[in-house]
């Protein structure tokens, strides 16, 4: 009886694992083995596929074959008993195009209100992704074990920290990788769960802001308690992208080590041009807080995001404010080629009650003022880019008196 060639051959490639599966053509014939050959592009001869010779099952692994993953290959299979079937040729394919990204490795660390997620490619030193290691991004799904309500977080790198969680609560998550340059989305990792700790005695510092004053950066934050000391650390932001490296060498800012105030001032030349992460920690001598949320700090934007300059035209019931480009030393205007939004704060000189206006325009009306009253105004600029949410410091306050009644024209 003639042996029929196997059918429906499937090639599954996950990371560096090459698996072939096929269907037997004739289940009634026993003791059949199967063998594969392969052929590279531009070659006439077929070569025996190691790992896939005389196979009794309907699955084989040819991961040991050192292929150029960007080169097209062709496979063929036949059944063997006393005689052999005809060859069945599989459509040619390029391994890299066919490959799926496997589940990443996930390592979790818990704090009281945060979880640190360290993500590594599932296959260490993968041949398939050798040229794409730094291009991996990850996305995750996280949920409270008790509720199951899922939150998705996209476009994260090999280290990510999730804040504003509840203490003593179990959170579960799964992570998948993506290579957006190749339109590849990977498969999810197994689910990992971790319980946040009891609430720490000292909360972390909050609301960290960086501003520029003269040739210095001024770093400010809020803290709940008095009589504390603080330290500030920085890290190059790109280091979070480094696959497989989970030793982050945070560095001290020398002028911000063991400071007793909720701000510190350090020279701009501490940082070369680039994007950094900053974090702050509080200590009372006995206990230490966990680190604050990490803020992104871009020296390019920070250096040029200066407080706006403005003129006031006073009327009886309003101010017209005209915002101009900030001045550098030498009185030359700074060209800011990214969209800004302006925050204007004004108050009656004799009162502390501040009112706020947010405007995209550079001419702003401050309405509902009382005649013959001194009002003070200060303004600052914000970038409109969500990812690099930066703010200038406030300008110096300018105080003006409104005109007498009936001068609204």
């Amino acid at each position: 009886k003639n042996l029929k060639s196997p059918q429906k051959v499937e090639v599954d490639i996950i990371d560096d694992n090459f698996i072939l599966r096929w269907n037997r053509s004739d289940e009634s014939v026993g003791n059949v083995t199967f063998s594969f050959d392969y052929q590279k592009t531009g070659m006439d001869n077929w070569i025996k596929l190691s790992g896939c010779q005389n196979i009794t099952s309907t699955k084989c692994n040819f991961s040991s074959l050192k292929l150029n993953v960007y080169e097209e290959i062709k496979l063929r299979i036949r059944a063997e008993k006393e005689n052999t079937s005809s060859w069945y040729e599989v459509d040619s394919f390029t391994p890299f195009r066919k490959a799926q990204i496997g589940p990443p490795e996930v390592h979790l660390e818990a704090e009281d209100k945060a979880i640190v997620i360290h993500i590594s490619p599932g296959t260490k030193d993968s041949v398939m992704w050798a040229l794409d290691g730094l291009s991996f991004t990850y996305s995750l799904v996280i949920w409270k074990n008790s509720s199951g309500v899922e939150e998705r977080i996209e476009n994260i790198y090999s280290r990510h920290k999730i804040y504003k969680l509840s203490p003593e609560t179990t959170y579960c998550l799964k992570v998948k990788a993506a290579l957006l340059t190749s339109w590849k989305i990977g498969v999810y990792s197994p689910v990992h769960c971790i319980k946040t700790t009891v609430e720490n005695e000292l909360p972390p510092p909050e609301n960290i802001e960086v501003s520029v004053q003269n040739q210095n950066y001024v770093l400010k934050w809020d803290y709940t308690y008095a009589n504390m000391t603080f330290q500030v650390q920085w890290l190059h932001a790109f280091l979070k992208r480094n696959p497989g490296n989970h030793l982050y060498k945070w560095k001290q800012i020398p002028d911000c080590e063991n400071v007793k105030t909720t701000q510190c001032v350090f020279p701009q030349n501490v940082f070369q041009k680039g994007i950094y992460l900053l974090r702050v920690q509080a200590s009372d001598g006995n206990n230490t807080s966990f680190w604050s949320e990490e803020i992104k700090f871009d020296t390019e934007i920070q250096a040029f995001l200066l407080p706006p300059v403005f003129n006031i035209r006073s009327l009886s019931d309003s101010f017209h404010i005209y915002i101009g480009a900030p001045k550098q030393s030498g009185n030359t205007p700074v060209i800011q080629d990214y969209p800004l939004i302006y925050e204007i704060i004004f108050w009656e000189n004799t009162s502390n009650a501040e009112r706020k206006i947010i405007e995209k325009k550079t001419d702003v009306t401050v309405p509902n003022l009382k005649p013959l009253t001194v009002y003070c105004v200060k303004a600052r600029a914000h970038t409109m880019d969500e990812k690099l949410n930066k703010s200038s410091v406030f300008s110096d306050a300018v105080c003006e008196k409104t005109k007498p009644g009936n001068t609204s024209k």
Epitope: E109, D112, L247, K251, T288
Partner: antibody, heavy 118, light 107 residues
């Protein structure tokens, strides 16, 4: 494979200094922290400090501040720990250890016995 | 400095026993705790990191758990080669600190 090889045992007089070396192989020391830990005879482990060989930044335990100096020579993949003003209670085995992923001391040297005796 | 207190300091047990060693921190250290095994005349050997992650090559009978201030190392079924001294260590803040050790002896 990763290996840390330390210098040989030392006998030093009280008040003197000792400098212990630790040579790494099988990895690039600039990518890691290098820690020093000591263990007095029959006692537990005590962290002395660590150095980042990439930029020579150090962190010392307050107990050793002012007496310890850690240095690194990346060209020979070697780190050094010098302890000065030695007293008898500094008699211990001194270990170097690599600080790897997740800030863990994952590989250790074989230890160097330093005996302080007059 | 963060103090770590291990208990018990000495433990006698037999091959096949299940043993648990605890480590208490003087303040919240998250899950930043590491466990080492040390045999006489040898350097410490890393067993568990980040409270519960077993190092590759360490037998599955070793497990770690806990967070915040209380941590445990469990050996599910003691083997002859497990008799040694065990140390916990916190890596949450400098200076790193160790527990005083737990000496596990054959009963």
């Amino acid at each position: 494979q990763v290996q840390l090889v330390q210098s040989g045992a030392e006998v030093v007089k009280p008040g003197a200094s000792v400098k212990v070396s630790c040579k790494g192989s099988g990895f690039n020391i600039k990518d890691y922290y290098m820690h020093w830990v000591r263990q007095a005879p029959g006692q537990g482990l005590e962290w002395i400090g660590r150095i980042d060989p990439e930029d020579a930044e150090t962190k010392y335990a307050p107990k050793f501040q002012g007496r310890v100096t850690m240095t690194a020579d990346t060209s020979t993949s070697t780190v050094y720990m010098e302890l000065s003003s030695l007293r008898s209670e500094d008699t211990a085995v001194y270990y170097c250890a690599r600080g790897g992923n997740f800030y863990v001391m994952d590989y250790w040297g074989q230890g160097t016995l330093v005996t302080v005796s007059s | 400095d963060i103090q770590l207190t291990q208990s018990p300091s000495f433990l006698s047990a037999s091959v096949g026993d299940r043993v648990t060693i605890t480590c208490k921190a003087s303040q919240n250290v998250g899950t930043n705790v590491v466990w080492y095994q040390q045999k006489p005349g040898k350097a410490p050997k890393l067993l568990i990191y980040s409270a519960s992650y077993r190092v590759s090559g360490v037998p599955s009978r070793f497990s770690g758990s806990g967070s915040g201030t209380e941590f445990t190392l469990t050996i599910s079924s003691l083997q002859p080669e497990d008799f040694a001294t065990y140390y916990c260590q916190q890596k949450n803040n400098y200076p790193y600190t160790f527990g005083q050790g737990t000496k596990l002896e054959i009963k």
